[in-house]
Amino acid sequence: MMTGTIETTGNISAEKGGSIILQCHLSSTTAQVTQVNWEQQDQLLAICNADLGWHISPSFKDRVAPGPGLGLTLQSLTVNDTGEYFCIYHTYPDGTYTGRIFLEVLESSVAEHGARFQIP
């Protein structure tokens, strides 16, 4: 039975040209995290594998930095980066947990972070 929940940074906004940290946290389970995939729609950004380290998709290698932790840092943001991002936690023995973050990249200098929220 899957008892865990994923807490994410929720709906967030950032300035064009700036950077943002995409962060998820798995709680309420003792399951072992074996791999985390970071995806934007149907595009893979990066994989963090507990044994192997990081695989950064070449399409994003100049703008994506691993971490902090299992999170992902997006740099040199453009308005085209606006959209949904998913953290997919592969765990043993529970299986797969998915968290969603919505990022809005703003032209203006006013970019406030949204509240944290949980996905069961």
């Epitope: 994989i47 990081w54 070449p58």
Partner: antibody
Framework: QVQLQESGPGLVNPSQTLSLTCIVS??????????WSWIRQHPGKGLEWIGY???????YYNPSLKSRVTISVDTTKNQFSLKLSSMTAADTAVYYC???????????????????WGQGPTVTVSS | EIVLTQTPLSLSVTPGQPASISCKSS???????????LSWYLQKPGLPPQVLIY???NRFSGVPDRFSGSGSGTDFTLKISRVEAEDVGVYYC?????????FGGGTKVEIK
Amino acid sequence: QVQLQESGPGLVNPSQTLSLTCIVSGGSIRSGDYYWSWIRQHPGKGLEWIGYIYYSGGTYYNPSLKSRVTISVDTTKNQFSLKLSSMTAADTAVYYCARGSIAARSGYFYFSGLDVWGQGPTVTVSS
Amino acid sequence: EIVLTQTPLSLSVTPGQPASISCKSSQSLLPSEGKTYLSWYLQKPGLPPQVLIYEVSNRFSGVPDRFSGSGSGTDFTLKISRVEAEDVGVYYCMQSIQLPLTFGGGTKVEIK
């Protein structure tokens, strides 16, 4: 010498789920140096990668199929499996399992070529 | 996803003569840590593909030295210096630098 052998039905009814298993012999699926893939080939056509699994359970699926695909691993039986749901005639193909090499360096890893392939059963979708 | 385009579609070669197959990528297969993850496969009739070349130019163990691979960026080539009867089949290139892995459409080689 590592060998891969697929097992599963040759005929699947439309809308049903295909289940295939790839048995690894001559080596351990727990080796951290490899990723384990499924690839299919439609009759008279080219090759389409379905997805991979690492021995510890991490996966990535081809976005074109990911809503229907599940790949799992059973290290105690030294095998990995493919499930493909909602089968249609367009899923009629030869299904191969294959082993790929992983290159890991300085905290990063990369996927190299597929060096061992199974024989590949033909799966036909028909009622 | 990365699209690989192979040319020609088919090739008819006299035994002992050379053959060359091109594989062009829709985007640069930039080297990661100095390596480009482009491999070549031969699928003989009725059999699964077998790896010939990995990381652009490295021959897999047991592969005859008449097979060679080269290229960089978006353009890659498989050369057979002297084609033999056992070389017939369909040749595929595959990139694994970016997921999903993708294959070229294949080049069918036959003997004249």
